[in-house]
Amino acid sequence: EEELQVIQPDKSISVAAGESATLHCTVTSLIPVGPIQWFRGAGPGRELIYNQKEGHFPRVTTVSDLTKRNNMDFSIRISNITPADAGTYYCVKFRKGSPDHVEFKSGAGTELSVRAKPSAPVVSGPAARATPQHTVSFTCESHGFSPRDITLKWFKNGNELSDFQTNVDPAGDSVSYSIHSTAKVVLTREDVHSQVICEVAHVTLQGDPLRGTANLSETIRVPPTLEVTQQPVRAENQVNVTCQVRKFYPQRLQLTWLENGNVSRTETASTLTENKDGTYNWMSWLLVNVSAHRDDVKLTCQVEHDGQPAVSKSHDLKVSAHPKEQGSNTAPGPALASAAPL
């Protein structure tokens, strides 16, 4: 001799967000007479999901025709599942009671877990640029995934990084989770073309991880090296002085020529040569009229790169090296002649 049993065959089910979840429930008898109700959670705070007799539950449909004689299948289907639907669902048999139906027996419960994909990882770097040999931090964030288990890796140009820290929040149970990771990257002069990649692997992604990238070109500043040289020109009273500005990044650069400490000319880098590693070269020159000088001249090439403090390189132009010209050019004129960059 038996009394009615409520059978929920599935201890747990997992459903992808956006799909439908079928929660199975059968009873073994038509008696006691009374409705079936579905709840999420147990105890006084449980949430009514479906009531066989009354109420409007737009996302819930019954799998069987409950009006059919001797129906004992009270399985339901919940459409358009979201992470907020996760929880344990109980099929509860009530017996007719007056004035209220009386809870008779509950099924063991079916735990619904919702598989939700993580959002595309967003990688962000430091607010200010840094120079090679410095260590910079990159953060990677992804949200809204479930279940909690997730794997995050960092790469620089395909090489896996090891210096990073990752947190998944919240620590306890939640409908969905977020991951936050910070990686430390040491910059080199060759990193203009480099990329930092954050890779997130999750059960919902079926082995096809999501990636977020940051270009180190947004982060790195490679300061220029300067070289000032002089070459004679056909006119014996002129000298060509060049300032080679090499291997800098980004492009923003302003160059000033100083003659014995006095500003002679300022120009902004325009037509640049790009190196294979992504850095730039630029060259500026001056034509110096030696005959206009009685004493040696100190020429300085001063470069302000990307708003940083200026760096400079000087070159001493010895007037005594040109005795022929001394005093022969009496016509007035500028001591320095402008030259367009190459």
Epitope: E2, S29, L30, V33, N70, K96, S98, P99
Partner: antibody, heavy 120, light 108 residues
Framework: QVQLQQSGPELVKPGASVKMSCKAS????????LSWVKQRTGQGLEWIGE????????YYNEKFKGKATLTADKSSNTAYIQLTSLTSEDSAVYFC?????????????WGQGTLLTVSA | ENVLTQSPEKMAVSLGQKVTMTCSAS???????LHWYQQKSGASPKPLIH???NLASGVPARFSGSGSGTSYSLTISSVEAEDAATYYC?????????FGGGTNLEIK
Amino acid sequence: QVQLQQSGPELVKPGASVKMSCKASGYTFSEYVLSWVKQRTGQGLEWIGEIYPGTITTYYNEKFKGKATLTADKSSNTAYIQLTSLTSEDSAVYFCGRFYDYDGGWFAYWGQGTLLTVSA
Amino acid sequence: ENVLTQSPEKMAVSLGQKVTMTCSASSSVSSSDLHWYQQKSGASPKPLIHGTSNLASGVPARFSGSGSGTSYSLTISSVEAEDAATYYCQQWSGYPWTFGGGTNLEIK
């Protein structure tokens, strides 16, 4: 047509047990709930409990738990009530009854009743 | 349990008279769950009215029922000799199913 045929009268001694039957015909026995109702002489009707023969499951009035046991045999379309530890209080007519339908709630069909007399 | 109290317990009326008997419930009963039976001496109960006011098959139109909540009634518009019997109300709103104590109708 639906018929419920109950077994004949019983005369039993106090402390003994008795098993009475209700044979159903004219419908699919396993699909309908059968109830048992007690009526003492000159008294009203008392619902004892019910059985669903489809899965041989029962539900009792708390007052009759431990006193009555309901069973059914699907092969013979017969329901049974067994009463134990009989006293004079158990002397009564016992009816089997069937609801009109599962969600009808009214006894559309009744057996003719079995008179149980408990006497030394 | 939901106790049903019927009144009067007994009544004697003349042929052709109108008769009304009541059934009062200790808890509210849905009108679809209140039923009436007629039982004659030595016979099993016979369904009379189901769901407060619906006549069972073969029941004469002189019988009618009404009511709601905790108060229900059965009326015979013009009593005939064959109506002598005990009348029981029964509720199906909550376990255990209960019957009233009955109203015995005697024809003078």
